[in-house]
């Protein structure tokens, strides 16, 4: 369950957390504290909907250890970090005669070919089909023979050279040369039944966060792939109304395992692409799940190549507190893959589930004999542990009451990681390097670069980590810089958003307060988007913007221009978010507090946060509202149905209403199975419908897209039915043929306009 990624700048995403940070200069009201004397315009709803003030990104693609590609005025340029200069790689006029609108491009690793993507048709969150053509950069012409078929589901270059693997009609094909015929690797693909090299709905959404289920070995010899079998998986069916002229609505059918239902089964194979023949069919060698997984339902949850002939697979039991990593070597004499029991590594949790959302990926050393992995330590904080493949125990190389977010690069001398250690702010992100010969030697590479403006970093390393791009996303305006790993010197500013900064000087912008409250001797962080000229002696209406799903974070140091910016700037509403029990990046004690008990503590903590906010003196406790999307819609609904008396109104967009309606992988991770022997009682106790009577005390707006493949319209339909059955007056809006993101241009504008009217009416604003 993730929030809609298409909603601008991820307002609704599960990210956010901050500290009492210095408010970035660009966010402060300039000139005067007197609102009446400030003649500057505010940030309006139209500004948000029309994206008047655009954050500039600097997207790059590393193609070597010192070069990256980037786009400028639709030309593709190559930047050489060694010499500090740019040159045109491909002019935008190259494809003037192409006749198609190019959606994306991908250069082969040897730089000889460019794959052009067009006819993009979205499927689910990550999946899509498209058409592809290949352009020969040496001959400066399109390859017209043996083209990749239309409606291809996935294409990927080999890591070196220019082999191509692609999936079409649920089967895998390999091209050794772009202009030669493809070799067919699988023959079993069947729509909605057998998926080779691509994920089914639940694996795409909840396991791999990708459509691809193909993994090239580092030198492109082997192609590993998963096969998913959805034969027994029940179908979700919903109407798709389409064009007005369609007399009978189309029925969409998707294999979708709900909690407790039959799951897809998975098999894993490796094929040697160097021994493909046009005479005989390709031989794929299966690597079976370890026996400890085969004895029950299980998932494949991670695939990582360690060396050219060593692969690691992570398997997870359906009850997701136990996982096993297999490390498998190619045995040339038998042509099989051997996975020694001595090299199996178990990861388990006694307090919850394994990993943040799934077991973390291993980062192997060059020889493939050891790896680094983020796991929970004895104190329940996620840190980096060093494993040798033949040893069961590992050595933690980081420690503290903070968490490592991700391992970003590994060289022979250093490991680079992102953590939230700096200044004890869980909602910050900084880049660190740790010396592998001495784990006590840790350097923060980003902490002091621009500490007021930049407290939330991500990074992109070149192929061998000689250079890196730092992407600062807040609390000030985004800043992109290029650095050398040799001395960690800043080489150049790539984008500083100075033009936007200038524009925003003329706007009454909100400020962001980031702090924590202490409940039961535990720090819980919150953020507040405060109106311009905020005066703590005045009373303001407050909107609680909630997500609150497991391992979520809504209080952070990220700069955003979103609906909250409008509400604070123009309507003088405080928009607050709070990370209670269940939230992430602060240790398992907080995150696993809601294990097997969704709809309890995380809901109670949002109510308690609102109570705490109303005691701060500047909140009008008669005008407190709550809103959320997806899991946030569930929490919003549970809060409004709690009968707390704290909230006047609220909006739930695409909410879960009963956990038996949501998918198996996500739901069972936290709730176990909906069976009498396991956790059925709590499944039934945690529904929104069971709280229907309490909605008489609040104003409620319920919104859902009718074509939501993720949180099905069924969930809101059942809330609506329960409310009607007990005579609750409420407001509702559906969005025809919209999915979980409600992201089409017209629907996006409509929903935010509609929600704005509702909030203004609730708060008695003109």
């Amino acid at each position: 369950m993730k929030t809609p990624w298409k909603v601008l700048l991820g307002l609704l995403g599960a990210a956010a957390l901050v500290t009492i940070i210095t408010v970035p200069v660009v966010l402060l009201n300039k000139g005067t504290d007197d609102a009446t004397a400030d003649s500057r315009k505010t940030y309006t709803l139209t500004d948000y909907l029309k994206n008047t003030y655009r954050l500039k990104l600097y997207s790059l693609r590393w193609i070597s250890d010192h070069e990256y590609l980037y786009k400028q005025e639709n030309n593709i340029l190559v930047f050489n970090a060694e010499y500090g200069n740019s040159s045109v790689f491909l002019e935008n006029s190259t494809f003037d005669e192409f006749g198609h609108s190019i959606n994306d491009y991908s250069i082969s690793p040897d730089g000889q070919f460019i794959l052009l993507e067009y006819n993009y048709v979205k499927q689910w969150r990550h999946s899509y089909t498209a058409s592809y053509d290949i352009y020969d950069l040496n001959k400066r012409q399109l390859i017209t023979e043996e083209r990749i078929p239309n409606n291809t589901q996935w294409v990927t270059w080999s890591p070196v050279g220019h082999k191509l693997a692609y999936v079409w009609n649920n089967d895998i094909y390999v091209k050794i040369e772009p202009n030669l015929p493809s070799y067919r690797i699988t023959w079993t693909g069947k729509e909605d039944i057998i998926y080779n090299g691509i994920t089914d709905w639940v694996y795409e959404e909840e396991v791999f966060s990708a459509y691809s289920a193909l993994w090239w070995s580092p030198n492109g010899t082997f192609l590993a792939y998963a096969q998913f079998n959805d034969t027994e998986v029940p179908l979700i069916e919903y109407s798709f109304y389409s064009d007005e002229s369609l007399q009978y609505p189309k029925t969409v059918r998707v294999p979708y395992p709900k909690a407790g239902a039959v799951n897809p089964t998975v098999k894993f194979f490796v094929v040697n692409t160097d021994s493909l023949s046009s005479v005989t069919n390709a031989t794929s060698i299966q690597i079976t799940a370890p026996a400890s997984m085969l004895i029950g339902d299980h998932y494949l949850c991670d695939v990582t190549w360690a060396t050219q002939e060593r692969i690691s697979l992570q398997w997870l039991r359906r009850i997701q507190n136990y996982s096993v990593m297999d490390i498998c070597d190619y045995d040339e004499s038998s042509g099989r893959w051997n996975c020694l029991v001595a090299r199996q590594h178990i990861e388990m949790s006694t307090t919850g589930w394994v990993g943040r959302f799934r077991p973390s990926e291993p980062h192997f050393t060059l020889d493939g004999n050891s790896f680094y992995k983020i796991i929970s330590n004895e104190e329940g904080y996620r840190h980096i542990c060093y494993f040798q493949i033949d040893k069961k125990d590992c050595t933690f190389i980081t420690k503290g009451t903070w968490e490592v977010i991700g391992i970003e690069a590994l060289t022979s001398d250093y490991l680079y990681y992102i953590s939230n250690e700096y200044k004890g702010m869980p909602g910050g992100r900084n880049l660190y390097k740790i010396q592998l010969s001495d784990y006590t030697k840790v350097t923060c590479l980003s902490c002091e670069l621009n500490p007021e403006r930049c407290q939330y970093y991500s990074v992109s390393f070149s192929k061998e980590a000689k250079y890196y791009q730092l992407r600062c996303s807040g609390p000030g305006l985004p800043l992109y810089t290029l650095h050398s790993s040799v001395n960690d010197k800043g080489l150049r500013v790539l984008e500083d958003n100075s033009a936007l900064d200038k524009m925003l000087q003329n706007v009454q912008m909100p400020s962001k307060k980031l702090d924590f409250i202490i409940l039961n001797e535990t720090k819980f962080w919150y953020q507040m988007i405060l109106p311009p000229h905020f005066d703590k002696s005045k009373k303001y209406p407050l909107l609680l913007d909630v997500y609150a799903g497991p391992c979520s974070q809504k209080a952070d140091t990220v700069f955003r221009l979103n609906w909250a910016t409008y509400l604070a700037s123009t309507e003088n509403i405080i928009v607050a978010s709070f990370d209670g029990r269940g939230s992430g990046y602060q240790g398992d004690k907080i995150m696993h507090a809601i294990n097997r008990r969704l709809g309890t503590f995380e809901v109670e903590d949002q109510i308690e946060a609102a109570r705490q906010f109303s005691k701060m003196g500047f909140v009008d406790n008669k005008r407190i509202a709550i809103w959320g999307w997806s899991y946030g819609g569930y929490v919003t609904s549970m809060v409004l149905g709690s009968g707390s008396g704290v909230f006047k109104c609220g909006i739930a967009v695409a909410p879960v209403s009963r956990w038996e309606y949501y998918d198996s992988v996500y739901t069972e991770r936290y709730m176990g199975l909906p069976t009498p022997e396991d956790n059925l009682d709590h499944y039934r106790n945690s529904t929104v419908m069971s709280r229907a009577e309490n909605f008489k005390q609040v104003e409620y707006l319920l919104i859902h897209g009718t074509a939501d493949d993720n949180v099905h319209f069924q969930q809101s339909a059942q809330i609506s039915k329960a409310l009607v059955d007990v005579g609750v007056d409420f407001q509702a809006m559906w969005y025809t043929d919209e999915d979980h993101g409600i992201a089409s241009s017209t629907a996006h504008q409509h929903i935010y306009t509609h929600m704005s009217h509702f909030i203004k009416q609730c708060f008695s604003l003109p």
């Epitope: 299966q286 079976t288 026996a291 096993v324 297999d326 099989r336 996975c339 020694l340 029991v341 199996q344």
Partner: antibody, heavy 119, light 107 residues
Framework: EVQLVESGGGLVQPGGSLRLSCAAS????????IHWVRQAPGKGLEWVAW????????YYADSVKGRFTISADTSKNTAYLQMNSLRAEDTAVYYC????????????WGQGTLVTVSS | DIQMTQSPSSLSASVGDRVTITCRAS??????VAWYQQKPGKAPKLLIF???GLYSGVPSRFSGSGSGTDFTLTISSLQPEDFATYYC?????????FGQGTKVETK
């Protein structure tokens, strides 16, 4: 040299109990899967149970579930099969076998021990 | 449970003959099939795994093939020491199951 030596077989009455041992040498049972497979006189092979000592996992054939218990003592590098409520149809040679890989194939077998259930 | 059906149940052959034994699974087991050789009064020995992978130390006259439901063990040139009973086994899912055996006897 890899060796698996079974012991503990013998004659037992129906309803009785027996404990078979499988002593391993030349490898550590923590780094392998241990299976028990039986063969009734003049018949084929029937898989009985499996244990992964390090992971603490066990699994049984339906025909013995609830009556037989597989266990291991890693300090002694030995696996056990506790057989209760024995029936005449449990009469067989019982082999322990191991595999060092994560698949359930058996690359090394003991010589077997005969269990006879008869009144 | 997956049933493994071997054929023939017995066969007579001479030294130097090419011998083929087949095994059919009641459902798809991919290539998760092993073959064992057992001599009277002795424990079984692993010959083939992964349908066609020769276990170390096993003579190259033994080979295996097949995928899905149909599998074959072939002895290219029967040697005196090859007279024994052969079993197939699936390890695609639990419970593990064996074929009923094929006895290779002297003609």
């Amino acid at each position: 040299e890899v060796q698996l030596v079974e012991s503990g077989g013998g004659l037992v009455q129906p309803g009785g109990s027996l404990r078979l041992s499988c002593a391993a040498s030349g490898f550590t049972i923590n780094d392998s899967y241990i299976h028990w497979v039986r063969q009734a006189p003049g018949k084929g092979l029937e898989w009985v149970a499996w244990i992964w000592p390090y992971g603490g996992f066990t699994y049984y054939a339906d025909s013995v579930k609830g009556r037989f218990t597989i266990s291991a003592d890693t300090s002694k590098n030995t696996a056990y099969l506790q057989m209760n409520s024995l029936r005449a149809e449990d009469t067989a040679v019982y082999y322990c076998a191991r595999f060092l890989g994560s698949s359930s194939i058996m690359d090394y077998w003991g010589q077997g021990t005969l269990v006879t259930v008869s009144s | 449970d997956i049933q493994m059906t071997q054929s023939p149940s017995s066969l007579s052959a001479s030294v130097g003959d090419r011998v083929t034994i087949t095994c059919r699974a009641s459902q798809d087991v991919n290539s998760n099939v092993a073959w064992y050789q057992q001599k009277p009064g002795k424990a079984p020995k692993l010959l083939i795994f992964g349908s066609g992978g020769l276990y170390s130390g096993v003579p190259s006259r033994f080979s295996g093939s097949g995928s899905g439901t149909d599998f074959t063990l072939t002895i290219s040139s029967l040697q005196p020491e090859d007279f024994a009973t052969y079993y197939c086994q699936q390890y695609s899912s639990y419970p593990l199951t064996f074929g009923q055996g094929t006895k290779v006897e002297t003609k």
